[in-house]
């Protein structure tokens, strides 16, 4: 990653997963004290409000539409003449939700489990989603898993969370192959509670097992 430490850092506030019609602030930070930035979209439909524009640290985008979904980068500069732009930032994926009906989310063996018991979350819908995405405490995470047709006519994905330690609130989203950053409405939230011999807890949840390869869109 040549020159990586000089690159700006692009992030989203409050989240890179944005409901349709909502707003998101894109922030470009740096170690070099850049005072102005340009922002561009790498894929999908161009966003006219960004074209040939210069920003100071941040830009509020919205109300977002499906056209805003995609991969963004920023470049920084000091306002010299002529302006010299930095190397591009890290890529930032903006996901737009609320574009399809919500899937349903359930837990096996159930939403209340004993400490150490294996938990699997199943996301399903009658809509022919290609992919499901799991969210925890309102934050989007990987893993994402392909939807598999099931015998009852739904399309389903099973997320193994591994042995339960703490509880948490989960939702899931569906998406299609040709628009991977355009997601459905969230499922109804599912509260997973963990009971132990000494106490029960549904607060202070730990992250899902790293074995599932979970990554955040936003740091």
């Amino acid at each position: 990653h040549e020159g990586g430490q000089d690159k700006p850092l692009l992030s989203a506030w409050p989240s890179a997963v944005v409901p349709r019609g909502g707003h998101v602030t894109l922030l470009c930070r740096s170690r070099l004290g850049f005072t102005i930035f340009s922002l561009y979209k790498e894929d999908g439909v161009p966003v006219p409000e960004l074209y040939n524009k210069i920003f100071w640290k941040s830009i509020l985008m919205g109300p977002v539409t499906p056209a805003h979904a995609g991969t963004y980068r920023c470049r920084g500069s000091h306002p010299r003449s002529p302006i010299e732009w930095s190397a591009p930032s890290n890529p930032l994926v903006i996901v737009v939700t609320g574009l399809f009906g919500k899937p349903s989310l359930s837990a096996q063996p159930g939403p209340t489990v004993r400490t150490g018991e294996n938990v699997t979350l199943s996301c399903s819908s009658r809509s022919s989603f290609d992919m499901y995405h799991l969210s925890r405490e309102g934050r989007a995470h990987e893993p994402r898993l392909p939807a598999v047709p099931s015998v009852n006519g739904t399309f389903q994905a099973d997320f193994p969370l591994g042995p339960a330690t703490h509880g948490g609130t989960y939702t899931c989203f569906g998406s299609l192959h040709d628009s991977p950053y355009e997601w459905s409405d969230p499922s109804d939230p599912l509260l997973v509670s963990v009971t132990g011999n000494s106490s029960s807890s549904s607060s202070s949840p730990t992250e899902p097992s790293s074995k599932t390869g979970i990554r955040r869109h936003l740091h």
């Epitope: 430490q5 000089d6 850092l9 070099l32």
Partner: antibody
């Protein structure tokens, strides 16, 4: 495990030069920038600047331009802070720290410099 | 430059008590705030980043909160090893600045 190990305490006279080292281990040295922080006796923390461990390019905070120089010996995974023409007000503990997403996750143990 | 105002400057508390230290910034830094603990004669140790993300290994009695310009770190059920100095730092971009520090002492 990740460690930043700094050189030992220094006692110098005004006008002299000091060079403090910070040896990094346990990670890929060129993947993370290195910062320097000053703490005067009984005072708080003051950011001095940073060095790009890929390119060797330094960036100095406004109060540390002129007499201060950051450098690297990449093959030895070591960063250096040199202060020229020492003054009494340079008496402090100096820390190196590793930067991840613009905050500092690992710090050296500090090098105490006394100018007297 | 972003100014960081930390309060209180010093604080006396007993083991088992709960304390809160606050940090105010001169401009919106969203959630880009870190907290450090420094014990006498030692280097600072990162406790919290992104305003509320606890570093692995830091006891759960510590919690960070806030966004925008108002932030705090709360320590529940103080333990003897929690006493020392605490500093906030914005990680929004250079120049980095630290709060003036809070000295947490045993009552």
């Amino acid at each position: 495990q990740i460690q930043l190990v700094q050189s030992g305490p220094e006692l110098k006279k005004p006008g002299e030069t000091v060079k403090i080292s910070c040896k990094a281990s346990g990670y890929t040295f060129t993947d993370y920038s290195m910062h320097w922080v000053k703490q005067a006796p009984g005072k708080g923390l003051k950011w001095m600047g940073w060095i790009n461990t890929e390119t060797g390019g330094p960036t100095y905070a406004d109060d540390f331009k002129g007499r201060f120089a950051f450098s690297l010996e990449t093959s030895a995974t070591t960063a250096y802070l040199q202060i020229n023409n020492l003054k009494n007000e340079d008496t402090a503990t100096y820390f190196c720290s590793r930067d991840v997403d613009l905050y500092f996750d690992y710090w050296g143990q500090g090098t105490t410099l006394t100018v007297s | 430059d972003i100014q960081m105002t930390q309060s209180p400057a010093s604080l006396s508390a007993s083991v088992g008590e709960t304390v809160t230290i606050t940090c105010r910034t001169s401009e919106n830094i969203y959630s880009y705030l870190a907290w450090y603990q420094q014990k006498q004669g030692k280097s600072p140790q990162l406790l919290v980043y992104n305003a509320k993300t606890l570093v692995e290994g830091v006891p759960s009695r510590f919690s960070g909160s806030g966004s925008g310009t108002q932030f705090s770190v709360k320590i529940n059920s103080l333990q003897p090893e929690d006493f020392g100095n605490y500093y906030c730092q914005h990680h929004y971009g250079i120049p980095f600045t630290f709060g003036g520090g809070t000295k947490l002492e045993i009552k």
